[in-house]
């Protein structure tokens, strides 16, 4: 399996909410002995490998933001801790999983990574990750809504969302 990042760059105004998304692609074994561990963290574009370093998102570690379930089951973080920090990670039945960040500030700008670990009984763990950039802007040059740039091309999409409101 692979992880796809539909958008490689999110440009958002301060105060907006954004949902960063990853998608699990390829054959996903739904057997009893297979589970998936999914999580999010901040990182840097390392010389050796992007997403190698795991940094917290708003002081929450990848351990705090994880989702753990089988195949294409839905799940979401119900932790009060995450929600107190304006964060929520979620996963649906179609292999999509996301992290929503509310009330963005300039400090939220940076590289974000999603990680999926496939745990197969008595086999090696299989790890894959996706990376995307978040740029939070302020002032007259900032967009009124989040603008997202697809990974495959440079065409941008404007996400119509109001400040302090969740968007999809």
């Amino acid at each position: 399996f692979k992880v796809a990042t539909p958008y490689s760059l999110y440009v958002c105004p301060e105060g907006q909410n954004v949902t960063l998304t990853c998608r699990l692609l390829g054959p996903v074994d739904k057997g009893h002995d297979v589970t998936f561990y999914k999580t999010w963290y901040r990182s840097s574009r390392g010389e050796v490998q992007t997403c190698s370093e795991r940094r917290p998102i708003r002081n929450l570690t990848f351990q705090d933001l994880h989702l753990h379930h089988g195949g294409h089951q839905a799940a979401n973080t119900s932790h009060d801790l995450a929600q107190r920090h304006g964060l929520e990670s979620a996963s649906d039945h179609h292999g999509n999983f996301s992290i929503t960040m509310r009330n963005l500030t300039l400090l939220d700008s940076g590289l974000y990574c999603c990680l999926v670990v496939e745990i197969r009984h008595h086999h090696s763990e299989h790890r894959v990750h996706g990376a995307m950039e978040l740029q939070v802007q302020t002032g007259k040059d900032a967009p009124s809504n989040c603008v997202v740039y697809p990974s495959s091309s440079q065409e941008s999409e404007n996400i119509t969302a109001h400040h302090h409101h969740h968007h999809h």
Epitope: Y37, V117, H122
Partner: antibody
Framework: QVQLVESGGGLVKPGGSLRLSCAAS????????MSWIRQAPGKGLEWVSY????????YYHDSVKGRFTISRDNAKNSLYLQMNSLRAEDTAVYYC???????????WGRGTLVTVSS | EIVLTQSPATLSLSPGERATLSCRAS??????LAWYQQKPGQAPRLLIY???NRATGIPARFSASGSGTDFTLTISSLEPEDFAVYYC?????????FGQGTKVEIK
Amino acid sequence: QVQLVESGGGLVKPGGSLRLSCAASGFTFSDYYMSWIRQAPGKGLEWVSYISNSGSPIYYHDSVKGRFTISRDNAKNSLYLQMNSLRAEDTAVYYCARDLPGWYFDLWGRGTLVTVSS
Amino acid sequence: EIVLTQSPATLSLSPGERATLSCRASQSVSSYLAWYQQKPGQAPRLLIYDASNRATGIPARFSASGSGTDFTLTISSLEPEDFAVYYCQQRNNWPRTFGQGTKVEIK
């Protein structure tokens, strides 16, 4: 604070049994996979057993398979290791350690000493 | 099982000196390797994860590199509290295995 505390070690005769416990505090125990790791006196570290956050899957080192049983009680924030048919070579300090998929042992207890001797 | 061989077994150095520790795997472990520090009477502490990343709170004098079968841990300038035993550990395959350790002692 965030910690793991092992208990239940002691002196036991070959062929005997012991049950080790590990009490977790300061973090959401039910989110974490857990492992037991041992260290014979003056020797290196050896991974013994692993249990997922839900209690399955479970793995054992070949040297303890069929003799040791790992279990957990998430309601009590506790991890256990039932050790049967103990041998002299099982003598070691036993540590419980926090684990996660795609991660490493990032929190360890201080260990409990198990001595198997006649 | 994957065997991790650490060298040297003992390293005798003075504070301020540079320490270079090696860990070699019997087969590739990709970058799924960690380094731990253990002081007498204490539990091990995670220093490095995924071959080259410092764990939370680990000083910058600790650095590491490598992938596949050859890995190195470097302490740029030894502090008195760095004299300890260092272990590498892989999580690429079952069972999880550790190296036999390198003792860094005061010369």
